[in-house]
Amino acid sequence: PQIFNKSNDGFTTTRSYGTVSQIFGSSSPSPNGFITTRSYGTVCPKDWEFYQARCFFLSTSESSWNESRDFCKGKGSTLAIVNTPEKLKFLQDITDAEKYFIGLIYHREEKRWRWINNSVFNGNVTNQNQNFNCATIGLTKTFDAASCDISYRRICEKNAK
């Protein structure tokens, strides 16, 4: 069974049929810093990628998990919740050969991993260690436990407008 449950992420995601909408790669941003996608009239901020009614931002700078969470929050977003196969494939297509923090943390009292919307992660986190309570994706095909204090890149996501 797959770990992904389309209804447990706290968001409403829409499946795109036909070609997936993408942000204009070559267009210049409008004065408000948004660029329109090629269909549906939805928009993502400049430097964010559109996929299935969501906007995603992959940083090139690195920071701790808490700083990453705060960075995403400041952009009106959250660290990414990777709980559908479609979203996983999309992120594997756009993540460089680096590690990226996502919105998955270990709850010691429960001895289980949860997404930051409190839904349970039903997969397996690799590289587990007593001091590794955060998770990354990107360098491998796995969800890897990581120290929350080490600096990694981050993936933020939010609803497209």
Partner: antibody
Framework: QVQLVQSGAEVKKPGASVKVSCKAS????????LGWVRQAPGQGLEWMGD????????YYNENFKGRVTMTTDTSTSTAYMELRSLRSDDTAVYYC?????????WGQGTLVTVSS | DIVMTQSPDSLAVSLGERATINCKSS????????????LAWYQQKPGQPPKLLIY???TRESGVPDRFSGSGSGTDFTLTISSLQAEDVAVYYC?????????FGQGTKVEIK
């Protein structure tokens, strides 16, 4: 919409090199892995490698023994695949394709014929 | 390298009937961490590039008709066309996207009986 447009057919002699281009449009070129896959006439598909344009990071199929180099020009959203020391069995259609592991968007293909 | 073996090599099916293509990998394609099988299916028509139908063994790509479905886990996988249409005549390839080098099956040609 997403488009990958490749350069035209090439005829090369054994031992020569070929450089195939793939111009991308309709998406953020820097942010997606781009792979190269070839198909010999009447044969199956063979993954050659991929590149992440934003950083230049590459992974190559070791079966090509250092004969292949993948590069990008982010200013023109164009990817290149150079294959050196060509042999007759390198005759194939060469495709660029967007994605890291499985590929939803493909170029139209470039036929490279190696013949003396 | 992981070897992908498809069967049969060719298949003739009547319009409206079910077509089934099998693919076997030389090692498991199951990812223990995210619990997905890294197996994709493509359709290729003459003179055209391949078209992605299925990835993660069973996730249909956007815009692909629901008569195409994928199943299987570990080393054994199946692509099913529930009701063959004339436009489904093509060569079908499986591909493992579990580890590099990513490898493809030899292809299965589907024709109308």
């Amino acid at each position: 919409q997403v488009q990958l447009v490749q350069s035209g057919a090439e005829v090369k002699k054994p031992g020569a090199s070929v450089k195939v281009s793939c111009k991308a449009s309709g998406y953020g070129f820097n942010n997606y892995w781009l792979g190269w896959v070839r198909q010999a006439p009447g044969q199956g598909l063979e993954w050659m490698g991929d590149i992440y344009p934003g950083s230049g990071n590459t992974y190559y199929n070791e079966n090509f023994k250092g004969r292949v180099t993948m590069t990008t020009d982010t200013s023109t959203s164009t990817a290149y695949m150079e294959l050196r020391s060509l042999r007759s069995d390198d005759t194939a259609v060469y495709y660029c394709a967007r994605g890291k592991e499985s590929f939803a968007y493909w170029g139209q293909g470039t036929l490279v014929t190696v013949s003396s | 390298d992981i070897v992908m073996t498809q069967s049969p090599d060719s298949l003739a099916v009547s319009l409206g009937e079910r077509a089934t293509i099998n693919c076997k990998s030389s090692q498991s394609l199951f990812n223990f961490s995210n619990r997905n099988n890294y197996l994709a299916w493509y359709q290729q028509k003459p003179g055209q590039p391949p078209k992605l139908l299925i990835y993660f063994a069973s996730t249909r790509e956007s815009g692909v008709p629901d008569r195409f479905s994928g199943s299987g886990s570990g080393t054994d996988f199946t692509l099913t066309i529930s009701s063959l249409q004339a436009e489904d005549v093509a060569v079908y390839y499986c591909q493992q996207h579990f580890t590099t080098p990513y490898t493809f099956g030899q292809g299965t040609k589907v024709e109308i009986k």
